[in-house]
Structure formats: structure tokens, C-alpha cells
């Protein structure tokens, strides 16, 4: 039950996280015009990964796409790549994790296969979350660098006469969405990995039975036999009972494909 809850929660958290990563990637407000200690302008500039926008005081907003690949900064291209990789991995992870969910019955899928898929999706979510966090952090670092550079050169001109005021950019809402979403995806992935441990058949020691043909008495030899484990194995665990002293329910302590929520 706890395993199913952990897996389900991991899936939901990851789903929210990936939705957030997609939202952040599509958002226009990755960087926004810094209004603090700046000459107040009647236009507000903000930029995303795909286009830059200008909002006039009337509310009129005009956005222009970056219709070039070669002309864009390498860092921006890297951030785009990281976010897309994060989304793709997350989407595949979601697809895999749907089939891995314990509460969903698909044919005669073994627990070990579900455990495998849960682990795979968990790793994918972790990498997806890390990609998003890395992408957002790279962009944030780029902003901080540019912010201080533009602060140093804020007033530029000829002959000491002020000609232009450089627009400084600060963190936009998309950065915070990206960080939170990446974190959620990462947490969801960790939860899936934890759930995988519970799903995987445990290495349980059972008391093996040894029969001696020569004697009339039956000797019970403890230890020795181990139930087969391993994520790739389809071998069913052999249940050997010590003199029928325990019920089948007591022995079968790990979840099987016959458990339902």
C-alpha cells in the first residue's frame, strides 16, 4: 500500500513538474526589464527563449520571434536545448511510468517488469528535473552577468553627454516556474526510485526442506535457499514452507502482481 502511494505520488508530482517545465519553456517572461533604480520608461520589455515582447503603457503588447538560429547567443541555444531535453525525457518518463503504475493492470506484466519501468521513469524524471534546473540556472547566471555589465556601462554617450540608457534585465517569472518545476520533477523521480525498491521482489531467506530417502524421519534444514531476485528476472519465487507452520499470507510479504489497491 505504501509503495503504491509512493509511486502514485511520485507520478503526480512529476506530472505537475513536467507541466511546469513545459510552461516555463513556453513563457515569454524569462527576463524582465529591471524597474528598480532605473529611469522609468512608459514601455516594459521582457524576453523569453523564443521571442521578445514590449508592452506599452496602454497595454498594447507586441512580440517578435527570434527568427534566426545562427545569430542567437550560444548560451540561449544551450538553455533551449536543456529545456527541450528535459521535456522530452519527462514526457517519455511519464509514458513509461503510466504503464509502471501498480494500480494499473496490463496483461500479465510481472512485478519485476513494473519495478524496472518504475526505476527507468524515476531516472528519467531525475534527469529531466536536472536539465530544467540547469537550463534555468544557466539563463539566470547569464542575466546576472549581463545585469552587472550593463550597470557598469549604464550611461553611455559621446563627449560626456548622456545619449542612451541601457535597459537592464532581471529574473522573470519563468525562471521561478522553471526552478520549482524542475525541483518537483526531481522529487517525483526520487519518489519513483524509492517506490521501485518496494516493488522489486526482495531477497527473502526461506527455510529449505531437505528430504532424506534412507530415513523415516523428515529433517528440516534451515537456511540455504534464496528466492531469486533481479530486475531482469521473470523467475517466480519458490515458496517453501517450514512444516506448514506459517500461512501463505505471512510468507508472501512482498507485493505481487495479484495485489490491487
Amino acid at each position: 500500500m505504501a509503495v503504491t502511494a509512493c509511486q502514485g505520488l511520485g507520478f503526480v508530482v512529476s506530472l505537475i513538474g513536467i507541466a511546469g517545465i513545459i510552461a516555463a519553456t513556453c513563457m515569454d517572461q524569462w527576463s524582465t526589464q529591471d524597474l528598480y533604480n532605473n529611469p522609468v520608461t512608459a514601455v516594459f520589455n521582457y524576453q523569453g527563449l523564443w521571442r521578445s515582447c514590449v508592452r506599452e503603457s496602454s497595454g498594447f503588447t507586441e512580440c517578435r520571434g527570434y527568427f534566426t538560429l545562427l545569430g542567437l547567443p550560444a548560451m540561449l541555444q544551450a538553455v533551449r536545448a536543456l529545456m527541450i531535453v528535459g521535456i522530452v525525457l519527462g514526457a517519455i518518463g511519464l509514458l513509461v511510468s503510466i504503464f509502471a503504475l501498480k494500480c494499473i493492470r496490463i496483461g500479465s506484466m510481472e512485478d519485476s517488469a513494473k519495478a524496472n519501468m518504475t526505476l527507468t521513469s524515476g531516472i528519467m524524471f531525475i534527469v529531466s528535473g536536472l536539465c530544467a534546473i540547469a537550463g534555468v540556472s544557466v539563463f539566470a547566471n547569464m542575466l546576472v552577468t549581463n545585469f552587472w555589465m550593463s550597470t557598469a556601462n549604464m550611461y553611455t554617450g559621446m563627449g560626456g553627454m548622456v545619449q542612451t540608457v541601457q535597459t537592464r534585465y532581471t529574473f522573470g517569472a519563468a525562471l521561478f516556474v522553471g526552478w520549482v518545476a524542475g525541483g518537483l520533477t526531481l522529487i517525483g523521480g526520487v519518489m519513483m526510485c524509492i517506490a521501485c525498491r518496494g516493488l522489486a521482489p526482495e531477497e527473502t531467506n526461506y527455510k529449505a526442506v531437505s528430504y532424506h530417502a534412507s530415513g523415516h524421519s523428515v529433517a528440516y534444514k534451515p537456511g540455504g535457499f534464496k528466492a531469486s531476485t533481479g530486475f531482469g528476472s521473470n523467475t517466480k519465487n519458490k515458496k517453501i514452507y517450514d512444516g506448514g507452520a506459517r500461512t501463505e499470507d505471512e510468507v508472501q510479504s512482498y507485493p505481487s502482481k495479484h495485489d490491487y489497491v
Epitope: V40, T41, A42, N45, Q47, S52, V54, R64
Partner: antibody, heavy 120, light 113 residues
Framework: QVQLKQSGPELVRPGASVKLSCKTS????????IHWVKQRSGQGLEWVVR????????YYNEKFTGKATLTADKSSSTAYMQLSSLKYEDSAVYFC?????????????WGQGTSVTVSS | DIVMTQSPSSLTVTAGEKVTMNCKSS????????????LTWYQQKPGQPPKLLFY???TRESGVPDRFTGSGSGTDFTLTISSVQAEDLAVYHC?????????FGGGTKLEMK
């Protein structure tokens, strides 16, 4: 069609207050900024203040902070500007105007102007 | 505040003549985000309120005759009337529509000989 109709001329004593009105029609009053611009006799234009009637947000030219107070009545689609502690230099024609949407923060429609004369 | 300087302060012309007036701002009115100049031109006839001619320095307001042309970028702007008509006699104002507070130039008065 869009119209901005301003109240009639005012003759006031120094130190007194005056409230100018600007009644709008032909558009959604709450969706556009209303500006007030001052023009002294034979001189250039001077931007005073603006108000967004939808929210009541205002931006003042620091020079007029404490001098001008803006209000807007949504029910009658009318903007008001009260000028207080009037001095001789406040004598001017005051125009109200509407900021156009998608027109580079420019004022596309103007009222006919209200003449304010401060005299003892 | 941004200082807007218009030149000349007055112009005496004859009908059909080409007229050019200038407007200079103390700071660039070019917004890097959309590459637009936030400069507005108004025409004010005697006893009337100003009338919008150009916004974004060169975008003509509807109803404005095409003999009027707005140009320039950054800090230097020009209003040109290709062939002056009697009805063009007015004061022409340029306005900084980028920085608060909005500021206007002193105006250029267009007169007939």
C-alpha cells in the same frame, strides 16, 4: 465617435481650488488612460498627469504632485482634475486627452481645453 | 527629465514649398526591445487642441495627408511637409513618449509669407 468634452472656463482667486471635468463618450472609458496637459499662453505643452479609470492608477509629473489630484467616475465616464492652492503661474489652458491603444504611448483624442485664469 | 529641443522655433514659408523641422531629445527614445522610437508629433492650429500626426516617430496616424513624413531615430527626428498647404499653418510639437514624465518640445510655428 470618440469625444472628450471639457468643462467651461474658470476664473479663480489665488490660493483657491478648481475642479476641471472631462466627459468622454464613444469608447470604453475604463480601458484607456486619460492624460491632462497644461499649455500656458503662447507657450509649449506640459504633461501633468494621467489616470487609468479602470483601476484608478495614476502617474504624476513630480512637478505637479500636490498640485493636481485626479479622480475618475466610471458611471458617468468622466475624469476630473482638481488643482489646489492656485498661483498666477497656474493660469493656463488644460487639455484632457486619451492615450491610444498601440499608438506608441501617444494621445490620439483631445478635449477642447479648459481655460483657468488665476486672478485677484 | 528628458529635454526636447525643437528647431527652428518658427518658419515662414510659401505654398507648395518643402518644409523640414527638427526635434532633438537629450536621451535616445529608441527601445531596443522592438526597435521603435517613442517620439510623437502633434499639429496644433490656433484655438484648437493638438492633433496626433505621427507616433513611433514615423507611423502616420489615419487621416493625416501623405505629404507629411516623420523620420529619424535615437535622439534626432525630423518632420517633413513635402508641399505646404495653407491649412498646414500651425504649431508642430514633438513629444517624448518613452520616459516619464512625458515631455514636449517648445514647438515650431509654421507661418505663411
Amino acid at each position: 465617435q470618440v469625444q472628450l468634452k471639457q468643462s467651461g472656463p474658470e476664473l479663480v482667486r489665488p490660493g483657491a481650488s478648481v475642479k476641471l471635468s472631462c466627459k468622454t463618450s464613444g469608447y470604453i472609458f475604463t480601458n484607456y488612460w486619460i492624460h491632462w496637459v497644461k499649455q500656458r499662453s503662447g507657450q509649449g505643452l506640459e504633461w501633468v498627469v494621467r489616470i487609468y479609470p479602470g483601476t484608478g492608477n495614476t502617474y504624476y509629473n513630480e512637478k505637479f504632485t500636490g498640485k493636481a489630484t485626479l479622480t475618475a467616475d466610471k458611471s458617468s465616464s468622466t475624469a476630473y482634475m482638481q488643482l489646489s492652492s492656485l498661483k498666477y503661474e497656474d493660469s493656463a489652458v488644460y487639455f484632457c486627452s486619451r492615450e491610444g491603444y498601440g499608438k506608441g504611448n501617444s494621445m490620439d483624442y483631445w478635449g477642447q481645453g479648459t481655460s483657468v485664469t488665476v486672478s485677484s | 527629465d528628458i529635454v526636447m529641443t525643437q528647431s527652428p522655433s518658427s518658419l515662414t514659408v510659401t505654398a507648395g514649398e518643402k518644409v523640414t523641422m527638427n526635434c532633438k531629445s537629450s536621451q535616445s527614445l529608441l527601445n531596443a526591445g522592438n526597435q521603435k522610437n517613442y517620439l510623437t508629433w502633434y499639429q496644433q492650429k490656433p484655438g484648437q487642441p493638438p492633433k496626433l500626426l505621427f507616433y513611433w516617430a514615423s507611423t502616420r496616424e489615419s487621416g493625416v495627408p501623405d505629404r507629411f513624413t516623420g523620420s529619424g531615430s535615437g535622439t534626432d527626428f525630423t518632420l517633413t511637409i513635402s508641399s505646404v498647404q495653407a491649412e498646414d499653418l500651425a504649431v508642430y510639437h514633438c513629444q517624448n513618449a518613452y520616459y516619464y514624465p512625458y515631455t514636449f518640445g517648445g514647438g515650431t510655428k509654421l507661418e505663411m509669407k
